[in-house]
Amino acid sequence: SEVEYRAEVGQNAYLPCFYTPAAPGNLVPVCWGKGACPVFECGNVVLRTDERDVNYWTSRYWLNGDFRKGDVSLTIENVTLADSGIYCCRIQIPGIMNDEKFNLKLVIKPAKVTPAPTRQRDFTAAFPRMLTTRGHGPAETQTLGSLPDINLTQISTLANELRDSRLANDLRDSGATIRIG
């Protein structure tokens, strides 16, 4: 039932998670862990914030957004296939067992082979038939028609459009958003 997010080997992955602080600067501790959210705390913690700052992080894991405004989305730098799996964003709301927990599934795909533009045959062999894009929700898949019907310029343009739309969607995906207070 986890929401699925995708990235390619070598890219940065983005796992969205948000909350709305009750008042400016009134922050809630958050932890990110590898693996589904356990009953308490986070397992295999990769990053943690407290009421003021990021107080624990490991290499390649960082918060790119303004966590002081409740954007605690996780960026994983230069991903490898080993980064695939479930990640837990846990918003540690004051109280007894009151935390908000979000399990996000990260799927890492092998890097696409860059085509050599002068050789149609090599491009056709290397270019995948399925291009994956990210909409405002779980991963969607767009299918290219039969490759012989599309010329190199069209494919190049389509690939650029898909890349641009993915980058745009990555900036603000349908992440978990909650209001505190």
Epitope: A36, I96, N98, D99, E100, K101, I178
Partner: antibody, heavy 113, light 107 residues
């Protein structure tokens, strides 16, 4: 605001089963724990079990294993507790709670022939 | 299972009096202790979490303290609306366990 609305009072016969409901509103149902607690007449509070609606994982008090079954329906933001093989000892008020901070109003279960 | 021993089981106190209720765990619960107030026919209300942190909206006359196995709830100056039954709860590990309760009545 967070609200938990529990189903109405039940009168059932010994040996039967009953399914109590707890409808959540005012928060993201799939992201927060639900606990169930029993209170027998003139007695204290007993923890029955826990469920996380996000993935359906559960924990039970050993005392209630085989007696209580916890489930959720994400589409209606409702948590359920089924109680089976009922006896008069199961007569009590049953509470659901988000975490243990926001409580439902309780459902009174009476088991009597 | 962790056993929570709460005392006293009942007590009488006067308005304005300082009241203390204690709870002892059968093992260290790492301050994962909560206090609840319950009035007749009502759901429990959370007062304190993590042993000493007051829930938003709870009057400041309530306070919690303790660590390890020993914890207490104090009402600095008793008011009429504080009458009811008080329960402690450990949530350090499953199964979660409550104390037997302390019935607080007006002297």
């Amino acid at each position: 605001q967070v609200q938990l609305q529990q189903s109405g009072a039940e009168l059932v016969k010994p040996g039967a089963s009953v399914k109590l409901s707890c409808k959540a509103s005012g928060y993201t149902f799939t992201s927060s724990d639900i606990n169930w607690v029993r209170q027998r007449p003139e007695q204290g509070l007993e923890w029955i079990g826990w469920i996380f609606p996000g993935d359906g994982s559960t924990k039970y008090n050993e005392k209630f294993k085989g007696k209580a079954t916890l489930t959720t329906d994400k589409s209606s933001s409702t948590a359920y507790m089924q109680l089976s093989r009922l006896t008069s000892e199961d007569s009590a008020v049953y509470f659901c709670a988000r975490g243990l901070d926001y409580w439902g109003q309780g459902t009174t279960l009476t088991v009597s022939s | 299972d962790i056993k929570m021993t709460q005392s006293p089981s009942s007590m009488y106190a006067s308005l304005g009096e300082r009241v203390t209720i204690t709870c002892k765990a059968s093992q260290d619960i790492n301050s994962y202790l909560g206090w609840f107030q319950q009035k007749p026919g009502k759901s429990p209300k959370t007062l304190i979490y993590r042993a000493d942190r007051l829930v938003d909206g709870v009057p400041s006359r309530f306070s919690g303290s303790g660590s390890g196995q020993d914890y207490s709830l104090t009402i600095s100056s008793l008011e009429y609306e504080d009458m009811g039954i008080y329960y402690c709860l450990q949530y350090d590990e499953f199964p979660l366990t409550f104390g037997a309760g302390t019935k607080l009545e007006l002297k």
